[in-house]
C-alpha cells in the first residue's frame, strides 16, 4: 500500500481538462478547469498554476483561479495537476489559456488614465486622448467596485485643458473592509472606434483630503492659537496637518507638523466637534502673521503617494508695521 502511494506521488499526473477563461466586472479575470482524466485514484489532487511570466505561483485544491488585472495586455495562466502541495514535485504537463485585451489600435487608447479619491467621498479620473483619435471623440468611463451590483457608467464627463475626466460618487463604507478593495475603471468611446483602456485603483492609494478650514486665530502672551475644522470622513489616526506661519516683519516662514489635537485651552472654542487646535510658540503679536494649513494622509492608513490636500484659505492676525 505504502509503495503504491509513494509511486502516485512521484508519477506525473495527466493534464487538467477544459481550461477556460472569462472576464467578470471590468477587470476580474477568472480561469476554471476540470480535474484530469485518469488521475491516480489514491492521489489527492492539487493544482499548480502561475501566470505567463512565472509570477504568482500557487498550489491549491480549487479548480479556479482569478486575478484583478487591467486588461491592457495579454495575460496567460498555466495550470498543472499534482498529488501534493510540494512545490518541488513535478506537476503534469502544463496547460495554458490566455486572454487578450479588446481589439483596437493601441495608438487610439487613452493614456495617463489615473484617479484620485477625493476626501473619501468621490473619485475623479482623468486621461489624455490617444495619438490616433479624432478630436470630437465622445468618451465614456465605466467603473465597478465590490459594493456595486453591476458596472456603472460615469455621467459627469468634463474637459480640463488637454485632459478629459469624469467624477463619480464613492463613499467610504464604515466598519467594513471596503478600503481593502479596488475600483475597476475602463475608458472607451461611444462609437467603439478606440481601444478601451483599463485601470485598477486600490482604495488605499490615491486619497486626497479636503483642505482644513481655519476658524479662529488668537494671541495669548507670545503664543498664537490656531483653531481649524478637520476634513470630514477621516479617523484621527489617519491624518496629519502642516501649519505654515508667515511673519510679515521678520519674513520668516515657519512650518509645523501637527497631530490632530483637542481644543483644551481656554483660548479655544471648546468641545466643537471635528475641530483641532495648535499653539504656535514665540510669535510677535504686534506684527502681521498669516496662517494656512494643509493635511495629508498617514502611510499606515493610505499608501504614500505624496498627495497633500490643497492649502486652506489664509487667515491673518496682528498688524502690519509701517515701513518708515
Amino acid at each position: 500500500d505504502y509503495k503504491d502511494d509513494d509511486e502516485s506521488r512521484t508519477e506525473t499526473q495527466p493534464p487538467v481538462t477544459n481550461l477556460s477563461v472569462s472576464v467578470e466586472n471590468l477587470c476580474t479575470v477568472i480561469w476554471t478547469w476540470n480535474p484530469p482524466e485518469g488521475a491516480s485514484s489514491n492521489c489527492s489532487l492539487w493544482y499548480f498554476s502561475h501566470f505567463g511570466d512565472k509570477q504568482d505561483k500557487k498550489i491549491a485544491p480549487e479548480t479556479r483561479r482569478s486575478i484583478e488585472v487591467p486588461l491592457n495586455e495579454r495575460i496567460c495562466l498555466q495550470v498543472g495537476s499534482q498529488c501534493s502541495t510540494n512545490e518541488s514535485e513535478k506537476p503534469s504537463i502544463l496547460v495554458e489559456k490566455c486572454i487578450s485585451p479588446p481589439e483596437g489600435d493601441p495608438e487610439s487608447a487613452v493614456t495617463e488614465l489615473q484617479c484620485i479619491w477625493h476626501n473619501l467621498s468621490y473619485m475623479k479620473c482623468s486621461w489624455l486622448p490617444g495619438r490616433n483619435t479624432s478630436p470630437d471623440t465622445n468618451y465614456t468611463l465605466y467603473y465597478w467596485h465590490r459594493s456595486l451590483e453591476k458596472i456603472h457608467q460615469c455621467e459627469n464627463i468634463f474637459r480640463e485643458g488637454q485632459y478629459f475626466g469624469c467624477s463619480f460618487d464613492l463613499t467610504k463604507v464604515k466598519d467594513s473592509s471596503f478600503e481593502q478593495h479596488s475600483v475597476q475603471i475602463m475608458v472607451k468611446d461611444n462609437a467603439g472606434k478606440i481601444k478601451p483602456s483599463f485601470n485598477i485603483v486600490p482604495l488605499t492609494s490615491r486619497v486626497k483630503p479636503d483642505p482644513p478650514h481655519i476658524k479662529n486665530l488668537s494671541f495669548h502672551n507670545d503664543d498664537l492659537y490656531v483653531q481649524w475644522e478637520n476634513p470630514q470622513n477621516f479617523i484621527s489616526r489617519c491624518l496629519f496637518y502642516e501649519v505654515e506661519v508667515n511673519n510679515s516683519q521678520t519674513e520668516t516662514h515657519n512650518v509645523f507638523y501637527v497631530q490632530e489635537a483637542k481644543c483644551e485651552n481656554p483660548e479655544f472654542e471648546r468641545n466643537v466637534e471635528n475641530t483641532s487646535c495648535f499653539m504656535v510658540p514665540g510669535v510677535l503679536p504686534d506684527t502681521l502673521n498669516t496662517v494656512r494649513i494643509r493635511v495629508k494622509t498617514n502611510k499606515l492608513c493610505y499608501e504614500d503617494d505624496k498627495l497633500w490636500s490643497n492649502w486652506s484659505q489664509e487667515m491673518s492676525i496682528g498688524k502690519k508695521r509701517n515701513s518708515t
Epitope: R237, F240, V255, Q259, K296, N298, K299, D304, K306
Partner: antibody, heavy 118, light 104 residues
C-alpha cells in the same frame, strides 16, 4: 513632559512566554501611535510594529508578523509587547516609541533588555 | 518594500569639521515621512530631524536635513565632541543600517 517608562530587564529560557510593558505619561495616550523597535546586540534598529491605543488598530512589520503581539490598555496608558514562545534569537534591547501620524519616533523609552538563554 | 541605504558606513572626522551623511531610498518617498536619529552607546536613540528637514524640539541648529524623492542628507555643520555617535535614517517601518561618525 512626555515620558515612556518601560518594564525592567528580563532573563528567560527558550520556549517561555514574556510580556513587557511601556507606560506613557505627559500627553494624550490615545492620540498617538505606540511602536516597538528591536536592537540586537551590536546591530541596527528594526521597526517591529505599532498600535494606536485610541482604537487598538495594530500594524506589524512583515518580519515580526505572527512572532509577537502588540497590545495596549488605554485605561492605564500602557502598551505591551509579548511572545508566546521565546527563542535565543529574541535576545535584544526592545524600545517602545511614541509615533505621531507622520511616522517619526519622537519619544523613546529607556529600553528593556531581554536575554533568552538555556 | 522600501529599502533605505545609508552611506558611508563610517565617517572619520575631527571636531569642528562638517559631516555629510546620506540616506538613499530604493524608490521615491514622501519627504514628510523621512526622519533622522542619533544613538550614543548605551543610550536610546533620539529624534533629530522629521519631515526630512524640520528639527525636533531641543536639537541644535548645527543639525540640518535636506533632500526629496530618493536622496536625503543629514548635515552637521561643525562637529562637537558630543556628536560622535551612530546616525540612522527612517521612514515608517524601515530604518537605514546606520552611519557611525567617529573621531579621526
Amino acid at each position: 513632559e512626555v515620558q515612556l517608562v518601560q518594564s525592567g530587564a528580563e532573563v528567560k529560557k527558550p520556549g517561555e512566554s514574556l510580556k513587557i510593558s511601556c507606560k506613557g505619561s505627559g500627553y494624550s495616550f490615545t492620540s498617538y501611535w505606540i511602536g516597538w523597535v528591536r536592537q540586537m546586540p551590536g546591530k541596527g534598529l528594526e521597526w517591529m510594529g505599532v498600535i494606536y491605543p485610541g482604537d487598538s488598530y495594530t500594524r506589524y512589520s512583515p518580519s515580526f508578523q505572527g512572532q509577537v503581539t502588540i497590545s495596549a490598555d488605554k485605561s492605564i496608558s500602557t502598551a505591551y509587547l509579548q511572545w508566546s514562545s521565546l527563542k535565543a534569537s529574541d535576545t535584544a534591547m526592545y524600545y517602545c516609541v511614541r509615533m505621531p501620524n507622520w511616522g517619526s519616533l519622537d519619544h523613546w523609552g529607556q529600553g528593556t533588555l531581554v536575554t533568552v538563554s538555556s | 518594500e522600501i529599502v533605505l541605504t545609508q552611506s558611508p558606513g563610517t565617517l572619520s572626522l575631527s571636531p569642528g569639521e562638517r559631516a555629510t551623511l546620506s540616506c538613499r531610498a530604493s524608490q521615491s518617498i514622501s519627504s514628510s515621512y523621512l526622519a533622522w536619529y542619533q544613538q550614543k552607546p548605551g543610550q536610546a536613540p533620539r529624534l533629530l530631524i522629521y519631515g526630512a528637514s524640520s528639527r525636533a524640539t531641543g536639537i541644535p541648529d548645527r543639525f540640518s536635513g535636506s533632500g526629496s524623492g530618493t536622496d536625503f542628507t543629514l548635515t552637521i555643520s561643525r562637529l562637537e565632541p558630543e556628536d560622535f555617535a551612530v546616525y540612522y535614517c527612517q521612514q515608517y517601518e524601515t530604518f537605514g543600517q546606520g552611519t557611525k561618525v567617529e573621531i579621526k
